[in-house]
Each structure stands twice: as C-alpha cells, then as structure tokens.
C-alpha cells in the first residue's frame, strides 16, 4: 500500500473520524432548519461541503473508487454520500436557473446519519429487506384492490353524480340552460338541495332503498362528483383510489354513506366484504411480513 492509502485507512477506521462526520451532519441539520439564515452561514455551508468531500476522498483513497469488490461505489450507502457531494457542487457552481428544486436535495444530507449510526443502519437494512419480501403481498393487494375496483366500477359508475334538483324552475329554464349558467357555489345552492353545513349537494338514488329527495326536489344525474370531483367510481383509477381509501380506512365511512345513499342500502354487502378482506386481512398480512423481516434481520 502507498503511504497515502495507509494514512487514509488509519483515518477511516479511527473513531474520532466517525465522531467528526456525525457532528458535522447533525450541525448541518440544525443549520438547515434555520428560516432566514444570516450571510455567514454560506461559509459554514462551504465548510460542510468540504468535510463531506474530505470524507469521501478518504474513503476512495482507502478502499478504491469502483473497480474492486469492496470499493467506494460498491457500497450503496456511499451512493448517498456521492449524490450529496455532487448536488452540493452543482447548486454552488453551475448556473441552472431555478435552483430551488435542486436545493431540496440538501435534505439528503440528513440521511447520511443512517450510514454513521450502526443501529440505525441495521434497522434501515431490515426495512429494505422487508420491502423486498413485501413484493408478493403487494402484488396480492394490488390484485385484490383491482378486482374490487372493477366490481365498484360496474356497481357504482356515475352514481355519485345523483343530486336533488329543484323542481320549481322559471318557465323558460331547463336543466341544461341552468347547468350552462351555473358558476359560483351560491348559484348551485339555488338549484340543488344542500344539507346545512354540507359542501356538496344532497345525494339521492333511483332504487327504492336509496336516498330520496325532499319535497320540491327531484333526483337527477348531473354535474360533478362529491369532494371537488375526487370521490367517484366513474373510472378504474378513481374506483381504485376509493378502494385504497377503504383498505386504509381513510374517512371510509363518508364514502360508505355517500355510496349507499346514491346506490341503495343493499350494497352494504360490498363494503363489508372490502373492509373485512382489504382492511382487516391484507393490512395485517403486510404487518406480518414486515414483522417477519425484522425478526430475520435481528437473527
């Protein structure tokens, strides 16, 4: 080994070197949290970049760059270091117009902590392993969600556009003429029935067990879907999102009530099956796989 490489190895294996990098990362994180950093922090930023560059140079000199088996770029953790340094120099010396997007990559510096703390490295390793093991469960989950999304699409397509529309129109007004002139929320409230405090028109349906309109209103299918158009079963993608929402139980009872009011209470069966299979079974299956992966990693 050349003297330079021997010195680099000595520095690399020294505990003080790890401590220096650790303190640098933590200090860097503190500086990144500053709202309006003073001018002198620019020089501190250069110092941090310099230390990171020195760290990488030491590693490259000690282990080699990329040719051998245990060289710098063969370790995925060093990829992070490399990216951090490249972006540090890019944002500083290359004029790329809107740099704010690139500045976001400075946050990656915080992730360097993982490679420095051994315990954290193990946990993250376990997490990555669990993600690899999750692939089969994920395929099963996506498949189940897709099947139920297709069923939802067939059962409820367009149903959430059903609204209670005012019967007593002016003599020259028609549904179409009104829809062409409606602009503001206030206009909508003139012609559609809204429950107090609701941001969407009252949903209704055409089956006997679906929601009925109050006196003076009739059920029509017109306009957009509830929640600014985001809640619907009108396309496969929207239906898939709705099913994902059921699986994760993200305000699912609202979706349940909306759909049952528009389609009919019989469709409660659909929701019972989805909640049992998707929310109770699949979610716990995912958790079980993650737990198994952590157990394996610990052993």
């Amino acid at each position: 080994f050349s003297p330079l490489r021997r010195i680099s190895i000595k520095i690399l294996v020294h505990s003080l070197f790890s401590m220096l990098i650790m303190c640098t990362i933590l200090t860097n994180c503190i500086f990144m949290t500053m709202n309006n950093p003073p001018d002198w922090t620019k020089n501190v930023e250069y110092t941090f970049t310099g230390i990171y560059t020195f760290e990488s140079l030491v590693k490259i000199l000690a282990r080699g760059f990329c040719v051998g088996e245990f060289t710098f770029l063969r370790d995925p953790w060093n990829w992070l270091d490399f990216v951090v340094i490249v972006f540090a120099y890019l944002t500083e010396f290359v004029n790329l117009g809107n740099v704010s997007a690139l500045r976001t990559f400075r946050v990656l510096r915080a992730l360097k902590t993982i490679s420095v703390i051994p315990g954290l490295k193990t946990i993250v390793g376990a997490l990555i392993q669990s993600v690899k093991k999750l692939s089969d469960v994920m395929i099963l989950t996506v498949f189940c969600l897709s099947v139920f999304a297709l069923i939802g699409l067939q059962l409820f397509m367009g149903n959430l556009k059903h609204k209670c529309f005012r019967n007593s129109l002016e003599n020259n007004e028609t549904l179409e003429s009104i829809m062409n002139t409606l602009e503001s929320e206030e206009d909508f409230r003139k012609y559609f029935y809204y429950l107090e405090g609701s941001k969407d028109a009252l949903l209704c349906g055409f089956s006997t067990d679906s929601g009925q309109c109050p006196e003076g209103y009739t059920c029509v299918k017109i306009g957009r879907n509830p929640d600014y158009g985001y809640t619907s079963f009108d396309t496969f993608s929207w239906a898939f999102l709705a099913l994902f929402r059921l699986m994760t139980q993200d305000y699912w009872e609202n979706l349940y009530q909306q759909t049952l009011r528009a389609a009919g209470k019989t469709y409660m069966i659909f929701f019972v099956v989805v909640i049992f299979l998707g929310s109770f079974y699949l979610i716990n299956l995912i958790l079980a796989v993650v737990a198994m992966a952590y157990e394996e990693q610990n052993q």
């Epitope: 055409f206 009739t218 017109i222």
Partner: nanobody, 124 residues
Framework: EVQLVESGGGVVQPGGSLRLSCAAS????????MRWHRQGAGKQREFVAR???????DYADSVKGRFTISRDNAKNTVYLQMNSLRPEDTALYYC??????????????????WGQGTLVTVSS
C-alpha cells in the same frame, strides 16, 4: 332513447273542452317536472302549466281556472284538461319533461326532453 308523444289535439268550438296527454317512453327511472308549453302562429312559445313529481302544480295567468294539469306516475303520462276554450288558445301544444333514464348500455342520463307537439284549434 326517451320519447315524449303528445295526443288529444283537434278542432273544438269556443267554450268547448279538450284533454291533451303526453306519454313518456323509454327506460325511465324518474320524471321530475312535466310542463306544457304552446306556440301560436307567428308568436313566441309560452308556458302553460307545470306539475312536479310530488304533484305540485303551477299555471300561466292566462289559463288559470280553465286548465288543469295532472299526471299518472305509473304510466309516465301527464294530462292537460282544457275547459272553456277560447280562440286565443289556438296553438301547437308541446310537452316538456325532466327525465332521468337508463341509456346507452345502462348508463344513467338526466335531461330535458320535448315532444313533437299536438295542434289545438279553437274555431267556430
């Protein structure tokens, strides 16, 4: 496709009566309001009467007390009973309805539908 067909028009003497009917056909799920309009020769179309799905009625001032609108929800039909007819009632009578129906492969559509019209002539 939804169709509205009017019938019952004809020639009648002043003071006489006529009963117009308008039947909606198609895969109808719900009919909201149903309205009668008329258009005399060289005149603009004017509203005559309206009935909602909960049977609330409304009439033009010129026909109040003489005309009666009613509907049969089971048959998807609206009727206009016209009594004490006057020469100025001579017009082509149109039926209009707000219909929600199952169309094109089972998808639901709401819209305003019109009939072709039936001619009423009041003349001595």
């Amino acid at each position: 496709e939804v169709q509205l067909v009017e019938s019952g028009g004809g020639v009648v003497q002043p003071g006489g009566s006529l009963r117009l009917s308008c039947a909606a056909s198609g895969r109808i799920l719900r009919i909201g309001y149903m309205r009668w309009h008329r258009q005399g020769a060289g005149k603009q179309r004017e509203f005559v009467a309206r009935i909602t799905d909960d049977s609330a009625t409304d009439y033009a001032d010129s026909v109040k007390g003489r005309f009666t609108i009613s509907r049969d929800n089971a048959k998807n039909t609206v009727y206009l009973q016209m009594n004490s007819l006057r020469p100025e009632d001579t017009a082509l009578y149109y039926c209009e309805a707000l219909v929600t129906a199952s169309v094109r492969g089972g998808s639901i559509h709401s819209g305003t539908y019109w009939g072709q019209g039936t001619l009423v002539t009041v003349s001595s």
